[in-house]
């Protein structure tokens, strides 16, 4: 019988607020004996894939997807999943990231430290939570 | 709070027609906005959306090439259908598309604004 | 191109008594699938959404299950004001197909 994969979960370094120009890396983590991670972006059809796993804990694996120079473009809704052999885990919530202008350049430590996704409210009329979704280093593709 | 589709009515078989979604209380943007149709006596079916952040447009296959989803202003998008034929004949929706935890929310559709193709 | 099948295409039911309606999803969609009731002369209402999550206002008769191709759909304690057409649709911005949907006729 085939074990129930848990949702993978997703943070964003240093955090979920970034200048313009500065960088940022998703963090995306699994039980271990993940084969791979997958970060989407704003559809499934727009995602980067990685192999490159390593072991966060005993029982953690983690995967880190960078973005050496954020651009306005990057903005958006962030999701991590896994595949596992032989299956594909659910979804981790969205994590949006909010690029944001800034006079102090590149190294401006106007973040939110450790940001990661967590529960969200149902959207009520007044929550309009899509940002714009990056187009640096994620690759539009057949998914699955 | 709502959004309501206008612009249906009865047009030549390979005519045009360019349907409307206006926001009423509030506007598109950080959400999805996306048109579905449903032929008299058959479910929805797909079209397109589009997305207000990223100004992303996304197609069911086979509407690419004779419809274009667009925005025309921060509360209304636009669906420019062409080459319209007896098949394309159905209430067409449009329906605000949100995020929730890790997945989306089609929470808020129109009324819906019929479309006749006959000569 | 995603193809949402939905089955039964339609089934009967007793007041009282309980369904069940399974989508397919011809490719892993994870979570990104909802669940509509519709009525004639109105647009697809907002029952499901991420697999099993109930909408609010939605009574708990309705509740969801699945992940990846394989979904379901339970209503019990059927009451007339039940009898419609339920429809599954994968609700990824980049593929948005709905199932053919259910006919639920109320005995």
């Known amino acids: 019988q085939e074990e129930d994969l848990p949702r993978p979960s997703i943070s964003a370094e240093p955090g979920t607020v970034i200048p313009l120009g500065s960088h940022v890396t998703f963090v995306c983590r699994g039980p271990v004996g993940v084969q791979t991670f997958r970060l989407e972006r704003e559809s499934r059809s727009t995602y980067n894939d990685t192999e490159d796993v390593s072991q966060a804990s005993p029982s953690e694996s983690e995967a880190r997807f960078r973005i050496d120079s954020v651009s306005e473009g990057n903005a958006g809704p962030y999701r991590c999943i896994y595949y596992k052999p032989p299956k594909w885990s659910e979804q981790s919530d969205y994590l949006e990231l909010l690029v944001k202008e800034t006079s102090g350049g590149p190294d401006s430590p106007d973040t939110e430290p450790g940001s990661s996704a967590g529960p969200t409210q149902r959207p009520s009329d007044n929550s309009h939570n899509e940002h714009a979704p990056a187009s640096q280093g994620l690759k539009a593709e057949h998914l699955y | 709070e709502q959004s309501v589709e206008s612009g249906g009515g009865l047009v030549q078989p390979e005519g045009s027609l360019t349907l409307t979604c206006k926001a009423s209380g509030f506007d598109f943007s950080r959400n999805a906005i996306c048109w579905v149709r449903q032929a008299p006596g058959k479910g929805p079916e797909w079209i397109a959306c589009y997305s207000f952040s990223s100004s992303a447009t996304y197609y069911a296959s086979w509407a690419k090439s004779r419809f274009t989803i667009s925005k025309t202003s921060s509360t209304t998008v636009t669906l420019q259908m062409t080459s319209l034929t007896a098949a394309d004949t159905a209430t067409y929706f449009c329906a605000r598309v949100d995020i929730y935890g890790g997945s989306r929310y089609w929470g808020m559709w129109g009324p819906g604004t019929l479309v006749t193709i006959s000569s | 191109e995603l193809v949402m099948t939905q089955t039964p295409a339609s089934v009967e039911a007793a007041v009282g008594g309980t369904v069940t309606i399974k989508c397919q999803a011809s490719?892993?969609?994870?979570?990104?699938l909802a669940w509509y009731q519709q009525k004639p002369g109105q647009p697809p209402k907002l029952l499901i959404y991420r697999a099993s999550t109930l909408e609010s206002g939605v009574p708990s008769r309705f509740s969801g299950s699945g992940s990846g191709t394989e979904f379901t759909l339970t209503i019990s304690d059927l009451e007339c004001a039940d009898a419609a057409t339920y429809y599954c649709?994968?609700?990824?911005?980049?593929?948005?197909?709905f199932g053919g949907g259910t006919e639920l006729e109320i005995k």
């Open positions: 649709q994968d609700t990824d911005i980049g593929s948005g197909a």
């Open positions: 490719q892993n969609i994870g979570g990104d």
